[in-house]
Amino acid sequence: AFGISGVQKYTRALHDSSITGISPITEYLASLSTYNDQSITFALEDESYEIYVEDLKKDEKKDKVLLSYYESQHPSNESGDGVDGKMLMVTLSPTKDFWLHANNKEHSVELHKCEKPLPDQAFFVLHNMHSNCVSFECKTDPGVFIGVKDNHLALIKVDSSENLCTENILFKLSET
C-alpha cells in the first residue's frame, strides 16, 4: 500500500494550478484492487462509462489511477493517517480530465469530466488500514466510504470504528 511513508518517499509535485486553493503534496500512479485482489477497471467513452470490479486475465495490464495527495485543512483525530496532525486527502483520476466523485444521494461512485478546481465530492480522506490496505472516506459525508457492492463500486456507510476493517471498503494500491 502507498501510505504516509510512501508520500514522504516521493518528491513534492510542482503544479501550475491549485485545487480548492491547495496543491498536491505528491502524485502517484497506482493500480487499485480490492482486499480480495480483484482489479478496479474502467471503460470510458465521451458520454458514458463503466467501473468494474473483476478478475483480470494473466496478460492484461491493470488500469491505473492517478492519486493526488493533499493535506486537509482540518486536524486529524486519528493516529497514523495524517501528516503533522492533518488528514490526508486524495483525488483519484483514471485518465486526464476525469475524476472519481461521490454521489451521496445515490450512494454511488461516479466518474465525472471536470476542470479544476475540483468539487469537494472528488476528495476522499485516506485511511491506512491493516494488511497494507487503505480506505477512502468521502470528504462530503464523513463515515461514508468507497466500497464494493455487487462487483461495482458504491458508497458504503460505516457505523462504527470496528467496521472500518470490513473487507468491502479495503483497497490495495500497487505500482504494478
Epitope: 470510458l44 467513452e45 465521451d46 494473466k58 492484461e60 488500469d63 483514471p94 485518465t95
Partner: antibody
Amino acid sequence: EVQLLESGGGLVQPGGSLRLSCAASGFTFSSYAMSWVRQAPGKGLEWVSGISGIDTSTYYADSVKGRFTISRDNSKNTLYLQMNSLRAEDTAVYYCARDLWIQLWGGGLRYPFGYWGQGTMVTVSS
Amino acid sequence: SYVLTQPPSVSVSPGQTASITCSGERMGDKYAAWYQQKPGQSPVLVIYQDTKRPSGIPERFSGSNSGNTATLTISGTQAMDEADYYCQVWDSSTGVFGGGTKVTVL
C-alpha cells in the same frame, strides 16, 4: 456520431513516400488511442501502427518499423501516417481505427477497435 | 512474434450454428476481439473482451476464450452474416490479427 475520414492514398513508385491523413469528428479525439490497419487486395487485416492518447507514445509492426511514422495533431483532430521507402508489399487499403474506449493512465495499446474509417487505397508500383 | 491461426473458411446452413476458432499460444490469457467484414466495407467490431457485444450487435453473436483457443459462435445464422471474420489480440502493445475466416451461408 463518430466519423473517421482517411485521405492521401494514391499511386506511388517503389522507394517513394506518401502521407495519409485521418480526419476525426464526433468525439474527443485527444482522449483516444488511434491506429492504422491495412488490408492488401484479397488478403486479411494487418495492424500497422498505433499512437497513444495519453502521451503520444508510438508503436509499430515489425514490417513497417523505421519506414513509417505515425503522428497526431490534436488541435486539428487529425491522425497521420508518413510512409517512406515504400515497397510493393505495402500496397493495401489503409484504415484509420479508433479505440473503443478512452485511454487510461499507464498507456499502452490494449483496447479493441470500436470505430473504423472507410479506408484509402495505396498502390506501390512502377 | 505472436501468431493467431483461423480456418480459412466455414460453411453453415441458415438457422444453424457457425463456430469460428482462433488459436494462439496461451490465448486464454489475453482478451480476444472479433471483427466482421463484408465485401467492400470496413470491419465492424462484433465481440470484445472475449464475450462482450457492442451495442447494436445481435445476440446471436457470442464468444468464448480459454486455453489456446478463442471461439466466435453465430447461433441461428442468417444470410446477412455471410462475411469475413477476424480475431484480434494485443501482444505487448502490438496488434495481432488472425488470417480471417470466410463464413458462407449455404
